[in-house]
Amino acid sequence: DAEFRHDSGYEVHHQKLVFFAEDVGSNKGAIIGLMVGGVVIA
């Protein structure tokens, strides 16, 4: 049987993903991070 129309059974929460690179001056390389909803996770 074909399914009757219903929405998906879960809510989609939209969050902003922000990639950033920070200059660390005299240190070697740079810090690269991923911010999700205001929290740095990587």
Partner: antibody, heavy 123, light 112 residues
Framework: QVTLKESGPALVKPTQTLTLTCTFS??????????VGWIRQPPGKALEWLAH???????SYNPSLKSRLTISKDTSKNQVVLTMTNMDPVDTATYYC???????????????WGQGTTVTVSS | DVVMTQSPLSLPVTPGEPASISCRSS???????????LEWYLQKPGQSPQLLIY???NRFSGVPDRFSGSGSGTDFTLKISRVEAEDVGVYYC?????????FGQGTKLEIK
């Protein structure tokens, strides 16, 4: 408040086409997720779902009656129309329209019903 | 089509006593979105059907808490903890997971 009311002929002859109108208030069929459907009930018998139309003009029909049914809407008039061709005495029933709205924050069930209109098919 | 089978078809109850109506579907009515679209409607004498329970166990607004719904898969139950005179009428289960939407035959609740 939400109200629905069915209208149409009380008596139709066999082979004729039945046209029923559901006029509603308290909601709009231009609202995302909104829909209106038709259900019928022969005298002393159980309920039978016929068709449903959604705000985006998507339609769903009972396969056993699909060849005879057409559902349409007039959003500006707050109306949904059901036509059923080739009427037969077994189509004698009370015909109801009911609202149903999709959405995670919606009931997603037939939460408001009209009072029903009785249609007799006889020559 | 999904066949909905209710039992009993007639249910005489003494006011204040509990009542239970069974509804079985011929196949699972679990929708692909994870929800089970099983509804209960009450048709009081001379009136249109009215929604009592949606998605198996959710009471519609204004429905007294003596009404409760439960079940999963193919086996569902409507319970009334203490029947009142105003509860008389025909109770229908309905599945809306699959086309066509289908109703049970109805259970007529009457007061003893």
């Amino acid at each position: 408040q939400v109200t629905l009311k069915e209208s149409g002929p009380a008596l139709v002859k066999p082979t004729q086409t039945l046209t029923l109108t559901c006029t509603f208030s308290g909601f709009s069929l231009s609202t995302s997720g909104m829909g209106v459907g038709w259900i019928r009930q022969p005298p002393g018998k159980a309920l039978e779902w016929l068709a449903h139309i959604w705000w985006d003009d998507d339609k769903s029909y009972n396969p056993s009656l699909k060849s005879r049914l057409t559902i349409s809407k007039d959003t500006s008039k707050n109306q949904v129309v059901l036509t059923m061709t080739n009427m037969d005495p077994v189509d004698t029933a009370t015909y109801y329209c009911a609202r149903r709205q999709l959405g995670l924050r919606s009931i997603d069930a037939m939460d408001y019903w009209g009072q029903g209109t009785t249609v007799t098919v006889s020559s | 089509d999904v066949v909905m089978t209710q039992s009993p078809l007639s249910l005489p109850v003494t006011p204040g006593e509990p009542a239970s109506i069974s509804c079985r579907s011929s196949q699972s009515i679990l929708h692909s979105n994870g929800n089970t679209y099983l509804e209960w409607y009450l048709q009081k004498p001379g009136q249109s059907p009215q929604l009592l329970i949606y998605k198996v166990s959710n009471r519609f607004s204004g429905v007294p808490d003596r009404f409760s719904g439960s079940g999963s898969g193919t086996d569902f139950t409507l319970k009334i903890s203490r029947v009142e005179a105003e509860d008389v009428g025909v109770y229908y289960c309905m599945q809306s997971s699959f086309v066509p939407l289908t109703f049970g035959q109805g259970t007529k609740l009457e007061i003893k």
